[in-house]
């Protein structure tokens, strides 16, 4: 019989092997790290062991053998916390509980891995997860004056308790208190996800900006990052569920082919080739730059037209280790004389997903790891702030607050956790017992919201699709979905005319001083004018009668008293009773890819800025006109906020951005919008019970 | 209110050791780490070392071999020692609070290195 | 170990003028830059933080900016008694280290 093909081996260069310590060196180092032990070295001798791994053992809920068994060994070498089982890190000022309920956390640094708004978001949510059972509040502050800083840190950062690399001690965090107390760190050596690897963004496509799914699969091939395959013109996309064969949903992934960042191309996408200093470049180049940073024209000729922008870095491409750490995976790229147009674990022993840096790995040796599935930001956030308030692990292996990373979808706190935290804290005032599972289930940061289920698909970049091969995404229908129809409410009162019974507004507007809560046909007026006054629920029917019952968002123009409605990729305006529209968005000096008006919030002189999903342009209320050249990326206007927010409205000078049962609500401050409160919109705006 | 106190020998003879005590107040040394600083005469600032809440300690690498950090936390005081002065070790020596930066110094002291 | 490079030793400015001093790092310290102003006699007093927060009591005429390696500490309207040295630092990698400092005089 034929041999079977042996693997073929190679040496990578800068390959750094794991430690070489032995199973008792490493288990001896971990019982003095984690309180277990008093010295870190002991005689090596297995019996003088057995009492530390008994305790161990017990507090892991491992079976108690004494031994260093594999189950125990197993236990040793999981990604967990750094804060130690046994006893503090050291020992702190005071009782180790905060002495009062408005908790302030500063984020004063970020991680490269994620973008910075979904960073924002997993610290209000993981936040969220113990105000939902506490009578705490959380409140987002710039500077010192917080009461819980968070940073990410490598090595020695800054506190005496030093990180580790890639996966062992993930973060730590310290107890209530004044200075390092309370403070929570996190290893930026790890690669911080949503716990479901590398999160990546799209664009266009028919899923909403919802985030690429990986591996998806496409055509009966799985694919872990995003593939120019079945296309012709370059731009990567990506399935944003597991399998794009059957549910068609996709989106465009970040690219130099899609579009540019700051810069000044207007966001344009590159030019492939362009002029630079005589020179023609192929690709985004760093030349005649001192950061590292990858740029490109987005003219053919630099030289002359001084037009560039900076190229967008994609989570799912960059690599780590190697000899190339935080460069790109370069597709296809050729290894051992074959091409590759994904990662691979070709010529690993250990079975590790590697890519390229270049187009040629045998010419070149530029290489790194692939992305893995990261660990999820807001379960190890949410582990950390539990000891920043207070709480230490627990032996529970269901419990939030045990030491072991564990990811699920689940709602993450256990009795246990609750337990813990009503003893520091007693109950929350608010009726949900454990938070919503949005806030718990890791959500991916820009799946379509509740209200946005039947949205049409986007349509791609200005421009037109090339036509792709067979297979490939193809832009969806463009319709509006057809409005449901508008139903009375009944004589009797029913649950339904609660709006604290409502899970998501349709919208939410300040429309003469009182916010109005839309939703299905109806809506609520409430006002905080001289004690809280709710009225309602009203039927838009006969309020606003050209109006259909379903909307998306609706904005007043307070000096004229013009109500602007917006539903899909259509506008109504309202001056009194006489109605114009329904407009068709385009007409407002927005490409035909918007179909969907998130909000608009008004600034001085007559103008307003519009936002749709992630980007907004400024708008002149007068003219109903666009300026097109304005448009920007809702992240540079507005930090922090969640990029798939679903409804946007100013009310009393501060902007609301709703997502879910949430708002992220942003202040002017120091001449930048800060996200300065997240709350949900029952319980906080409309003061629900 | 914060305040950070250094208390040093003035004078030093070449090859001999130095110690300084610095007495902190308004804080805990369990809540702030501290740094030593010194500057010679007319000349920058040189970081020298760094004792962390939990007693872990950090040095400059080119002093390391000569310098100690040591602490007790239950009378606020922070100890450093250097052995083998020379000349150029003439300079005034702080001691400050570290959080994010050093955000208290103390009014430093001066040690001259002769014979 | 992190050399941090403060290009100009003195500066000289007028009352009333705009002055911005930089700081280059020998590699990328992300935003753990701060600065300090050291008048003539006295300890150095920190002023910004975290390469761009202003230090409780500062007049907001003194801003930082700058990540990974390019800093920059700016006096929007230089004052008499801004006449000191200011020197960076950064506490991303022990040891930590300072720039050789800036001399901010007043012509």
């Known amino acids: 019989a034929p041999h079977q093909r042996q693997p073929t081996y190679v040496v990578f260069p800068r390959d750094l092997k794991t430690s070489n310590l032995t199973d008792t060196q490493l288990a001896e180092d971990y019982l003095y790290r984690y309180g277990y032990t008093r010295a870190a070295q002991m005689m090596g001798e297995k019996q003088s062991l057995r009492p530390a791994l008994l305790m161990l053992q017990k507090q892991l809920s491992l079976p108690q053998t004494g031994e260093l068994d594999s189950e125990t060994l197993k236990a040793i070498r999981s990604p967990r916390c750094g804060v130690p089982d046994v006893g503090k890190f050291q020992t702190f000022d005071g009782d180790l509980k905060w002495h009062h309920h408005n908790i302030t956390y500063w984020i004063q640094s970020y991680t490269e891995d994620l973008p910075r708004d979904v960073i924002d978001d997993s610290f209000a949510r993981a936040f969220a997860v113990w105000s939902a059972v506490t009578p705490l509040t959380f409140t987002r502050v710039y500077g010192l004056e917080a009461d819980i800083v968070i940073q990410f840190g490598v090595a020695e950062h800054g506190d005496g308790y030093p990180f580790d690399g890639k996966d062992g001690l993930l973060a730590h965090a310290f107890p209530p208190g004044p200075g390092i107390q309370g403070d929570a760190h996190f290893d930026d050596d790890e690669l911080w996800s949503l716990g479901k690897g590398a999160v990546v963004p799209t664009y266009f496509g028919n899923a909403n900006g919802a985030p690429c799914h990986f591996p998806f699969t496409f055509e009966g091939r799985s694919y872990l990052s995003c593939t120019t395959d079945g296309r012709n013109d370059g731009k990567p996309w990506c399935g944003t569920t597991a399998d794009y064969d059957t549910d068609r949903k996709y989106g465009f992934c970040p690219s130099e082919n899609l579009y540019t960042e700051h810069g000044n191309g207007d966001g344009k996408p590159c030019v492939f080739p362009f002029i630079f200093e005589g020179h023609s470049y192929s690709a985004c180049t760093t030349k005649g730059r001192s950061d590292g940073y990858r740029w490109c024209a987005t003219t053919a000729n630099y030289d002359q037209d001084k037009a560039d922008g900076f190229c967008p870095t994609r989570a799912d491409v960059t690599v780590t280790g190697g000899n190339s750490a935080g460069e790109m995976c370069v597709f296809p790229f050729v290894f051992l004389g074959k091409q590759y147009s994904t990662c691979t674990s070709e010529g690993r022993s250990d079975g590790r997903l590697w890519c390229a840096t270049t187009s040629n790995f045998d010419a070149d040796k530029k290489w790194g790891f692939c992305p893995d599935q990261g660990y999820s930001l807001f379960l190890v956030a949410a582990h950390e702030f539990g000891h920043a308030l207070g709480l230490d692990h627990s032996s529970v292996p269901e419990a939030l607050m045990y030491p072991m990373y564990h990811y699920h979808e689940d709602s993450p706190l256990h009795e246990d956790d609750i337990k813990g935290i009503h003893h520091l804290y007693g109950r929350g005032s608010k009726p949900d017992p454990r938070p919503p599972a949005t806030t718990a289930a890791e959500p991916q940061p820009t799946a379509p919201p509740t209200m946005c289920s039947t949205a049409p698909p986007m349509a791609y970049p200005t421009g037109g699709p090339t036509v792709a091969p067979t297979g490939a995404p193809s832009p969806g229908p463009t319709g509006p979905p057809t409005a449901g129809p508008s139903e009375a409410p009944t004589e009797s009162s029913t649950p339904d005319d609660n709006p604290c019974n409502v899970d998501v507004f349709d919208a939410i507007a300040d429309i003469q001083g009182a916010l109005h809560f839309f939703k299905d046909g109806r809506y609520w007026k409430f006002s905080n004018h001289g004690g809280n006054q709710l009225q309602g629920p009203f039927l838009i029917a006969r309020t606003w009668p050209a109006f259909p019952s379903k909307l998306n968002s609706a904005f007043e123009d307070p000096q004229p008293k013009k109500i602007f409605f917006f539903l899909w990729a259509q506008m109504w305006v309202y001056t009194g009773q006489s109605v114009l529209g329904p407009r068709s968005l385009d007409k407002l000096g927005l490409g035909s890819e918007v179909t969907l008006v998130t909000g608009l919030l008004p600034r001085r002189g007559g103008k307003a800025l519009l936002i749709s999903r992630e980007r907004i342009w400024k708008f002149d209320l007068k003219s109903q006109k666009v300026d097109p050249q304005s448009v920007t990326r809702l992240d540079n206007e507005f930090s922090g906020v969640p990029w798939n927010s679903h409804n946007v409205f100013q009310y009393q000078d501060k902007a609301y951005f709703c997502h879910d049962k949430y708002f992220w609500r942003v202040s002017f401050h120091n001449r930048v919008n800060q996200v300065d409160h997240v709350a949900y919109v029952t319980y906080d705006l409309l003061q629900c019970p | 209110q914060v305040q950070l106190k250094e208390s040093g020998p003035g004078l030093v003879a070449p090859s001999q050791s130095l110690s300084i005590t610095c007495t902190v107040s308004g804080f805990s040394l369990l809540s702030y780490g501290v740094h030593w600083v010194r500057q010679p005469p007319g000349k920058g600032l040189e970081w020298l070392g760094v004792?962390?809440?939990?007693?872990?300690?950090n040095y400059n690498s080119a002093l390391m071999s000569r310098l100690s950090i040591s602490k007790d936390d239950s009378k606020s005081q922070v100890f450093l020692k250097m052995n083998s002065l020379q000349t150029d070790d003439t300079a005034i020596y702080y001691c400050?609070?570290?959080?994010?930066?050093?955000?208290?110094w103390g009014q430093g002291t001066s040690v001259t290195v002769s014979s | 170990d992190i050399v941090m490079t403060q290009s100009h030793k003195f500066m000289s400015t007028s009352v009333g003028d705009r002055v911005s001093i930089t700081c280059k790092a020998s590699?990328?310290?992300?935003?753990?830059v701060a600065w300090y102003q050291q008048k003539t006699g006295q300890s150095p007093k920190l002023l910004i933080y975290?390469?761009?927060y202003r230090n409780t009591g500062v007049p907001d005429r003194f801003t930082g900016s700058g990540s990974g390696t390019d800093f920059t500490f700016t006096i929007s309207s230089v004052q008499a008694e801004d006449l000191a040295v200011y020197f960076c630092?950064?506490?991303?990698?022990?040891?930590?280290?300072f720039g050789g400092g800036t001399k901010l005089e007043i012509k």
């Open positions: 004792i962390w809440t939990g007693g872990t300690t």
């Open positions: 975290s390469s761009s």
């Open positions: 590699q990328d310290v992300r935003n753990t």
């Open positions: 400050a609070r570290y959080y994010y930066g050093m955000d208290y």
């Open positions: 630092q950064q506490h991303y990698i022990t040891p930590y280290t």
